[in-house]
């Protein structure tokens, strides 16, 4: 008979295939983790449909200068479809994992610092555009909060533009028996000795791909164009459909670049819940669906993580 080990957290089964597996080009990837924390509302920032409050996350750029890189969308339910949307609105739940530990979990639940999806935005350079993603919250759910505290700075490459992107979040509160996510307890510490203890560690993955059946044109340099907004909305919805697990916290900074159309975005996951291989393979598995639903022919998928380490004390930026 086969060798059997006792299963961590107890044996559970589900009829759905929970792990998607597709090809990846092997990369030595390193992750950046940080605390998500809300700050004061930003005056004058543009909000998108479905939002009722826009908050900013302060990040430090690679040069060490403080840069405001995005919005936080709160849980204003909006079930109407976006004008011009080709599909149903993205389903967004604005809570992070529920306060009760899932059955079989070996650790306490993660505590969410904000009660809404957080935006982590890298701006684009002059050859590309980046604008607000239209996200509709169709469900509101309770989020856990921790006392307000000074946020830990974290760094992502900045391309010197001031067009922010709203994070599209799909952090769902789900039944552990159906998502089977109870096998990995929340991580509560960062990978860098100088960083503070984190109540919610997150990992950022930089994803890029080509849309080979589209040509880059000036409309994709201008976030105000319908073409830009529609393509960004389609890609946001695609991401939310692909990364359905509760540990996917959202996406940000969808950018378009020349070369057919090169799409770049940053995906945010709860730390310790996915590896660089699966981020890419899950996306790869849905290329066919993207082609049929959105008429997007996707190729040259690449995933790496936003470089680490960073220093919470010095604000050291991303190398290179």
């Amino acid at each position: 008979s086969g060798h059997t080990n006792s299963t961590p957290g107890g044996e559970k089964e589900t009829s759905a295939t929970q792990r998607s597996s597709m090809p990846i080009s092997t990369k030595n990837a390193v992750s950046m983790t940080s605390r998500l924390s809300s700050h004061s509302p930003v005056s004058g920032s543009s909000t998108t449909q479905g939002q009722d409050v826009t908050l900013a996350l302060a990040m430090e750029s690679a040069t060490g200068s403080a840069t405001t890189l995005g919005h936080v969308v709160t849980s204003a339910p909006d079930t109407s479809a976006a004008p011009g949307s080709t599909g149903p609105p993205a389903h967004v739940v604005t809570s992070a994992p529920d306060t009760s530990a899932a059955p079989g979990s070996t650790g306490p639940p993660a505590h969410v610092v904000t009660s809404a999806p957080d935006t982590v935005t890298s701006a684009s350079d002059s050859a590309s555009g980046s604008a607000s993603t239209l996200v509709h919250s169709t469900t509101s759910a309770r989020a856990t909060t921790t006392p307000a505290s000074k946020s830990t700075p974290f760094s992502i490459p900045s391309h010197h533009s001031d067009t922010p992107t709203t994070l599209a979040s799909h952090s769902t509160k789900t039944d552990a028996s159906s998502t089977h996510h109870s096998t990995v307890p929340p991580f509560t510490s960062s990978n860098h000795s100088t960083s503070p203890q984190l109540s919610l560690g997150v990992s950022f993955f930089f994803l890029s791909f080509h849309i080979s059946n589209l040509q880059f044109n000036s409309s994709l340099e201008d976030p105000s164009t319908n073409y830009y907004q529609q393509l960004q909305r389609d890609i946001s919805e695609l991401f939310l459909q692909i990364y359905k697990q509760g540990d996917f916290l959202g996406l940000s900074n969808i950018m378009f670049r020349p070369g057919s159309v090169v799409v770049q975005s940053t995906l945010v996951f709860r730390e310790g819940t996915t590896n660089v291989h699966d981020v890419e393979t899950q996306f790869n598995q849905r290329k066919t669906e993207a082609a049929s639903r959105y008429n997007l022919t996707i190729s040259d998928i690449s995933v790496r993580d936003v470089p680490f380490p960073f220093s919470a004390q010095t604000g050291a930026g991303v190398p290179g």
């Epitope: 299963t7 998607s20 092997t26 590896n275």
Partner: antibody, heavy 120, light 107 residues
């Protein structure tokens, strides 16, 4: 209870192919990724690749990419690993190992191993 | 590829000793580090995953620690049944490489 039962020992000549089976029971076969790992005599463990039986997608270690084929028969809840163009250095115990379910990054159950001897 | 280097390659200790095995990854693997125990003639057995989470049924004398590129398996009080070879595994990115193993013997 979960069990992974592998096929029996094989002796093959260089240049031949071998196909090792791994029958799974005690869980939903299509829900868990199945990996293959080998261990040469007195040596360490070497990851070869995996199959997701739910989607039939495979991913291989580049070292074996041209010689290994991993398949799955859902109806029989069995995974297979075929290695072609065998050489003497392929003599090893071959294990199937189940990866824990969603967000579970470890092998929680292993087969008992299948010794493949390549000798002329 | 991420290379995993274990040290020592073998060690001999007395019953009751505290034993430490280290595993170094060539790149940050973000706690996606697994430890297995393999006894002679047997299949590997899962001990620890996510660098520090003990599998149910594994004695509490086993513990894991570390982050980034450096990880440690500790046996707080060595028992005769712990004689085995211990392997670490990178589960951050493919190929899911293993360390070369640490053979643990009783003096």
């Amino acid at each position: 209870q979960v069990q992974l039962v592998q096929s029996g020992a094989e002796v093959k000549k260089p240049g031949a192919s071998v196909k090792v089976s791994c029958k799974a029971s005690g869980y939903t076969f299509t829900t868990y990724t199945m990996h293959w790992v080998r261990q040469a005599p007195g040596q360490g463990l070497e990851w070869m690749g995996y199959i997701n039986p739910g989607s039939d997608y495979t991913h291989y270690n580049q070292k074996f990419k041209d010689r290994v084929t991993i398949t799955a028969d859902k109806s029989a809840s069995t995974a297979y690993m075929e290695l072609s163009s065998l050489r003497s250095e392929d003599t090893a115990v071959y294990y199937c190992a189940r990866q824990g379910n969603y967000a579970a990054y470890y092998f929680d159950y292993w087969g008992q191993g299948t010794l493949v001897t390549v000798s002329s | 590829d991420i290379q995993m280097t274990q040290s020592p390659s073998s060690l001999s200790a007395s019953v009751g000793d505290r034993v430490t095995i280290t595993c170094r990854a060539s790149g940050n693997i973000h706690n996606f580090l697994v430890w297995y125990q393999q006894k002679p003639g047997k299949s590997p057995k899962l001990l620890i995953y996510n660098a520090k989470t003990l599998t149910s049924g594994v004695p509490s004398r086993f513990s894991g620690s570390g982050s980034g590129t450096q990880y440690t398996l500790t046996i707080s009080s060595l028992q005769p049944e712990d004689v085995a070879t211990y392997y670490c595994q990178n589960f951050w990115n493919v190929p899911f490489t293993f360390g070369q193993g640490t053979k643990l013997e009783i003096k």
